[in-house]
């Protein structure tokens, strides 16, 4: 008893965030095919016509490639074969983002899966105590972020307390004209207190934290992706 | 292994065609793993790249010399060519043809050994 | 276009030195750069690409660091024929732009 056609493959994607300016990775994983003649990989962006990456008998194809991704593109080539048809994307620009389609056609049979890429730019913020000021205060610093976050300021020992007025934020643009460079300044803080900077866009979330003692300043810092 | 050797007149006279062609040897042009560029060095000076190519012609030009290039790729005799127009004596250099490592790192290697042109009346 | 700056452009060294030359990028490449090594009527050739990656067939003296837009060659004991000039080239975006180039002659 035969089946006509070939069979459906689980094609799997996940949702991720580039930070422009840097490189980035579109994830997807298919059933593995040992056969890596008969395995077609095709990366396309929906509005675009062409193609952002073709990879196909053991080979990169991009004779149908639009121009806005020449030169930026890769499949991690030695990985096909075990199921791996993640796509590497050089110099994230804020235009890659967008829902991507990853297709794959192998002996087994052909499938596909959508992914959603967001891009911005977010960096890990910098606690520093600032001895310039009349009165002790922390300068958090975040070097590129877009689009423009929110920051808000947190304490262990107040907690739930809003520091809105005993702080200021201020947004500076960088050179190429896109990210900016986050500075806010905490006033009025106390002794052995740990304080926290946070940053959040709708693309990452970032915190840096300080802990400010007579005889020592600790710091930490994380960078969360959002919706990953 | 693969093996780039540029060809072409080692004399252009001003305001002509400077036309040149780079034979592969040892691999395939139609390889998609690869891009096909052209570079030039002014002489005792440093490195300037021209432009690449894709086997199936598609084509990325420095905007510097845009308006005065065409690159166009000959599969069936494994070769690329790089023609530029109006040339002057600024245009005398040593001309390299390159592959790049793959599709995302162009970085170049190999290099053809180079072949000298002189733009002189 | 991205701007590549080599530092310093002439460097006078002796057999077994360490030797370090820098590249400097107007802005951002990431890890995008390549050293090659140039001698004269030759061709360059290849030594180090994605900033820290050894080209095959290159010796092991050679080494590559650095991201961003700051970026160092370092041969940790010169030998008598790798005096020669050597060029940084970015290519992390069109147009590829290479450095002035660094001439590493004999002290």
């Known amino acids: 008893f035969g089946i006509s056609g070939k069979h459906f493959i689980t094609v799997t994607t996940f949702t991720s965030a580039g930070n422009i300016g840097e490189d980035g990775t579109l994830s997807c994983t298919f059933e593995p095919d040992i056969k890596l003649n008969g395995i077609v990989i095709q990366w396309l962006k929906e509005g675009i016509k062409g193609l952002v990456h073709e990879f196909k008998e053991g080979k990169d194809d991009l004779s149908q490639q639009h121009e806005m991704f020449r030169g930026r593109t890769a499949v991690f080539a030695d990985q096909v074969v075990v199921g791996n048809a993640s796509l590497r994307l050089k110099n994230v620009q804020l235009t890659d983002a967008g829902t991507y389609t990853c297709y794959i056609r192998t002996s087994k049979g052909k499938g596909n899966a959508n992914l959603e890429y967001k891009t911005g730019a977010f960096s890990m913020p910098e606690i520093n105590v600032d001895y310039n000021a009349s009165s002790e205060s922390l300068r958090c610093e975040a070097p590129r972020w877009f689009p423009q976050p929110t920051v808000a300021w947190a304490s262990q020992v107040d907690q739930g307390a809003n520091f809105s007025e005993v702080s200021n934020t201020s947004f500076e643009l960088n050179s190429e004209n896109v990210t900016m460079k986050v500075v806010s300044v905490l006033y009025n803080v106390t002794i052995n207190n740990t304080y926290s900077c946070m940053i959040e866009n709708d693309i990452a979330k970032a915190t840096g934290d300080i802990k400010v003692t007579d005889s020592e300043v600790k710091r930490r810092s994380q960078l969360q992706l959002l919706n990953s | 292994q693969v093996q780039l050797q540029e060809s072409g007149p080692g004399l252009v006279k001003p305001s002509q065609t400077l036309s040149l062609t780079c034979t592969v040897s040892g691999g395939s042009i139609s390889d998609g793993s690869y891009y096909w560029s052209w570079i030039r060095q002014h002489p005792g000076k440093g490195l300037e790249w021209i432009g690449n190519?894709?086997?199936?012609?598609?084509?990325y030009y420095n905007p510097s010399l845009r308006s005065r290039v065409t690159m166009s790729v000959d599969t069936s005799k494994n070769q690329f060519s790089l023609k530029l127009s109006s040339v002057t004596a600024a245009d005398t250099a040593v001309y390299y043809c390159?592959?790049?490592?793959?599709?995302?790192?162009?970085?170049?290697?190999?290099w053809g050994q180079g072949t000298l042109v002189t733009v002189s009346s | 276009d991205i701007q590549m700056t080599q530092s310093p452009s002439t460097l006078s060294a002796s057999v077994g030195d360490r030797v370090t030359i820098t590249c400097r990028a107007s802005?951002?490449?990431?890890?995008?750069l390549a050293w090659y090594q140039q001698k004269p009527g030759k061709a360059p050739k290849l030594l180090i690409y994605e900033a820290s990656s050894l080209h095959s067939g290159v010796p092991s003296r050679f080494s590559g660091s650095g991201s961003g837009t700051e970026f160092t060659l370092t041969i940790s004991s010169l030998q008598p024929d790798d005096f020669a000039t050597y060029y940084c080239?970015?290519?992390?975006?069109?147009?590829?732009?290479f450095g002035g180039g660094t001439k590493v002659e004999i002290k």
């Open positions: 080239q970015q290519d992390n975006s069109y147009p590829y732009t």
């Open positions: 390159a592959r790049g490592l793959s599709t995302i790192d162009e970085a170049f290697d190999p």
């Open positions: 190519i894709y086997y199936s012609g598609s084509t």
């Open positions: 802005k951002s490449i990431s890890s995008w």
